[in-house]
Interface confidence: medium
């Protein structure tokens, strides 16, 4: 069962500056929308270690965004 519900941004807290690349299973980018006016970078960690929000202003987040955009466009 979901423990907490809300309809705003997907991340709370400013986000971590970096995550070890070896620990990353996947990265998801949420672009600004009606629900949230900022870009969010969500990292899913390997071995069921949960998820982390990357600070979108961090160097690693900027690199991930670039990489994903290159792949998609």
């Amino acid at each position: 069962f979901p423990m907490f519900k809300r309809g705003r941004c997907l991340c709370i807290g400013p986000g971590v500056k970096a995550v070890k690349v070896a620990d990353i299973e996947k990265a998801s980018i949420m672009y600004p929308s009606n629900n949230c006016d900022k870009i969010e970078v969500i990292i899913t960690l390997k071995e069921n270690k949960g998820q982390r929000c990357l600070n979108p202003k961090s160097k690693q987040a900027r690199l991930i965004i670039k990489k994903v955009e290159r792949k998609n466009f």
Partner: nanobody, 129 residues
Framework: EVQLVESGGGLVQAGGSLRLPCAAS????????IGWFRQAPGKEREGVSL????????YYADSVKGRFTISSDNAKNTVYLQMNGLKPEDTAVYYC??????????????????????WGQGTQVTVSS
């Protein structure tokens, strides 16, 4: 050095109240989300409540909604868990923990202890019937 120190636990009768403070030091309070977890003997650690000091957002597990209230005093770098209407099933060791970020999917958060960077030592809460 980052430290989280819980206090305020004890023995209380069913229906009673306790207030658990979690004093934080060694990091910028506003940059973190503070969560309360609990662990009863033989059970997994479960999320109870959390608060984001930066915007005051609060969240509660269904089992404690309407009975527990989380609040923070940023000047004192302390988060409080006010527990009213305590039940025997609330008996557990209560831990506070800190993380710099928690993501949601589909507007829901599933508490995962792995997502928290720092933990306190815990405080025992026993509710007798």
């Amino acid at each position: 050095e980052v430290q989280l120190v819980e206090s305020g636990g004890g023995l209380v009768q069913a229906g009673g109240s306790l207030r658990l403070p979690c004093a934080a030091s060694g990091f910028t309070f506003d940059d973190y989300v503070i969560g309360w977890f609990r662990q009863a003997p033989g059970k997994e650690r479960e999320g109870v409540s959390l608060i984001s000091s930066s915007d005051g957002s609060t969240y509660y597990a269904d089992s404690v909604k309407g009975r527990f209230t989380i609040s923070s005093d940023n000047a004192k770098n302390t988060v409080y868990l006010q527990m009213n209407g305590l039940k025997p099933e609330d008996t557990a060791v209560y831990y506070c923990a800190a993380t710099s970020s928690i993501p949601y999917y589909s507007g829901s958060y599933y508490p995962n202890p792995f997502e928290y960077d720092y933990w306190g030592q815990g405080t025992q809460v026993t509710v007798s019937s």
